[in-house]
């Protein structure tokens, strides 16, 4: 006979039961897998020279044996010759010193005989009316159980609890939930209505976070805007980690607090998506826009408190990157293009009205024009930037406009709307004698000077009315005064001032006549 099979022959010893009190006892046999079985027993008495035989009789009338030697445990498969679907009777005969001792017989259907297991696999944990509810699938063929739990916190020892009787395909247990500390739970089962039967092993730990996730204590810093129009958000202080019970200190699923970053891009409200949530470990790159950043802590019971920070817009402006041409049909902006098929968001807002919502327009994805420029145009009728005031313009770009973290700043600049040529004309031009051959010309600042980077320069023009000779004097945009020298006494002059932008010549102010009186000596 093969060792893996039950041997259908007479056993190799005489069947002489000694009837002594010692010998094999507590035989139990059960299924341990879909096709595997196990029998185990105790042996009372001296074990030297004892050979064990697991005997089995089938309902067909045939009997067989497994010789196990000194071992008191045997595993066999459903291919070993023992009928697992029909009733069999099993016992152990232990042979030593020419005598045989028998265990009591057990009669069962092996396939249906299952050793009670603890809850296995996925134990679902939920919150129910301030308590913890655990639920799991009843192990196969084990409906009808009583269940106990034990639990501990990082600072306490095990406490035992009762889940009550279970009689369904799913079993559950209500357990205490701690508000602010993590807990470790384990469960065990035994056959219902068999108080003398042994408990299963304890289940694997079920790690449960506190009901309230901890408040995230973190700090951020944001780097300077790079040449690619993006700046990195970095975490300066990590959130503190939760203290865990002993069995949950490895990679224990269920107890962890996850921290997520919720990013809300305040600029460019016309884009497709304004909010994005991402893991705290994955710190994003941001455009130069203004953002609100929230850190949300959550555990298996849901989100907890959050902390919100405001990241202001990057105020660095590019004075020359934007070219604006105003024609009879309307206005066109030009700027250095990004890659092929880029979507641009053009946002503008009157200076001084930063609290109000900015106006914005999203372009269709566009490729660079032959000069490498991207453009955006609008008609005069649209009224866009039509008022004669200073506007802050920001242009953002993205090849993936629906992905919030892939926007970058192309440029940020200022533009004077409406008829800037006329609106920017300096007023209150005045001339004062300065010396015998010079005058000081003063004027009120142009409206263009309220728009950073827009006013390129003032030009002061002086015309000699006798000779019709004209001289022009450029003046820094920060200055509102110039001294005209080498003038001749008694000659009539006219002076005018204009304010120029990078792309537009301003309109001259009203001519102002003056002359230097001829000095008569006494």
């Amino acid at each position: 006979c093969r060792t893996s099979e039950c041997c259908f022959q007479d056993p190799p010893y005489s069947d002489a039961d000694s009837g002594s009190a010692s010998g094999p006892r507590d035989l139990s046999c059960y299924r341990i897998s879909s096709a595997g079985y196990e029998c185990s027993w105790q042996y009372e008495g001296p074990t030297a020279g004892v050979s064990h035989f697991l005997r089995c009789c089938l309902s067909s009338g045939r009997c067989c044996y497994f010789a196990t030697g000194s071992a008191t445990r045997l595993q066999f498969s459903d291919q070993a010759g023992v009928s697992v679907l029909h009733t069999v009777t099993l016992w152990v005969e232990s042979w030593a010193r020419n005598r045989t001792e028998k265990s009591p017989e057990v009669t069962l259907q092996l396939y249906k005989s299952v050793k009670y297991k603890p809850p296995l696999g996925d134990i679902k944990v939920s919150k129910l009316a301030g308590q913890l509810r655990m639920e799991w699938e009843t192990p196969d063929n084990q409906v009808g159980a009583e269940v106990q739990f034990r639990h501990r916190t990082p600072s306490s020892s095990w406490k035992l609890g009762d889940c009550g009787p279970q009689d369904d395909d799913t079993e559950s247990c209500l357990c205490p939930l701690e508000m602010n500390v993590a807990q470790e739970f384990q469960l065990r089962r035994r056959r219902l209505g068999s108080q003398g039967s042994s408990w299963s092993k304890w289940s694997s730990p079920v790690c449960v976070p506190p009901e309230n996730p901890p408040q995230p204590q973190v700090r951020f810093s944001v780097e300077q805007l790079g040449r690619d129009g993006r700046r990195r958000l970095t975490l300066k202080e990590q959130p503190t980690q939760l203290e865990l019970p002993e069995g949950c200190q490895g990679p224990a699923p269920g107890v962890e607090v996850t921290y997520q970053l919720q990013l809300h891009m305040l600029s460019c409200p016309c884009k497709a998506k304004a909010t994005r949530t991402l893991p705290l470990e994955k710190m994003p790159y941001l455009s130069g826009a203004a953002y609100n950043v929230a850190v949300i802590s959550s555990n298996r019971f849901g989100p907890g408190p959050n902390q919100t920070w405001h990241i202001p817009a990057d105020t660095h402006t590019e004075p020359v990157a934007l070219n604006i041409s105003v024609g009879t049909n309307g206005t066109t902006m030009y700027w250095p293009a990004r890659a092929q098929s880029t979507t641009y968001c053009i946002e503008w807002q009157p200076v001084g009205q930063e609290g109000s919502l900015a106006t914005c327009n999203l372009t269709a994805p566009q490729d660079p024009d032959p000069a490498g420029m991207a453009t955006y145009s609008w008609s005069r009728e649209s009224g866009a930037m039509g008022q004669e005031k200073c506007y802050h313009i920001t242009i953002f770009a993205s090849a993936h406009p629906k992905k919030l973290t892939l926007w970058s700043t192309v440029l940020s600049t200022y533009h004077f709307g409406g008829n800037a040529s006329a609106a920017g004309t300096p007023h209150h031009v005045s001339v004062k004698n300065h010396s015998l051959d010079s005058v000081s010309v003063d004027w009120a600042p142009s409206l263009l000077s309220t728009c950073p980077g827009v006013l390129k320069e003032y030009v002061v023009r002086c015309r000699d009315e006798d000779s019709n000779q004209v001289s022009e004097h450029p003046v820094q945009p920060t200055e509102t005064q110039v001294t005209l020298s080498d003038l001749r006494a008694g000659v009539a002059y006219t002076v005018q001032v204009r304010a120029d932008t990078a792309w537009l010549r301003g309109a001259w102010s009203q001519p102002q006549r003056f002359s230097i009186k001829v000095q008569v000596s006494d």
């Epitope: 259908f8 022959q9 007479d10 056993p11 069947d15 002489a16 039961d17 009837g19 005997r55 009789c57 089938l58 309902s59 009338g61 045939r62 009997c63 067989c64 009733t87 069999v88 009777t89 016992w91 028998k102 009591p104 017989e105 057990v106 009669t107």
Partner: nanobody, 126 residues
Framework: EVQLVESGGGLVQAGGSLRLSCAAS????????MAWFRQAPGKEREFVAG????????HYVDSVKGRFTISRDNGKNTVYLQMNSLKSEDTAVYYC???????????????????WGQGTQVTVSS
Amino acid sequence: EVQLVESGGGLVQAGGSLRLSCAASGLTFRNYAMAWFRQAPGKEREFVAGITWGGGLTHYVDSVKGRFTISRDNGKNTVYLQMNSLKSEDTAVYYCAGKTQGSTWYHLTPDGYDYWGQGTQVTVSS
């Protein structure tokens, strides 16, 4: 000397009941599988019911299933046959037999058994 002694037979009306006993001596009773056979006049001895040494398994011939029950009490070294709903065709001499439980625990033929009793008569009248 091994002895198996049957008792409990007698005359009974159809539909009635009887309980047969077989007391064993001179052997370690709990080492033996036990069986009941019967033999009607002019017929061969036939297997009726069998039981393993511990009583965990039983086997019956189809004609008595649901009507007869075999049991044993190892403390009293006795095997029983409870016979209910008796029919006239159950009339026979009933024998108790014992066999060591080696590679089989019952045989449908008498030659597989080591020890036999003298038999007890059961007569069912209609």
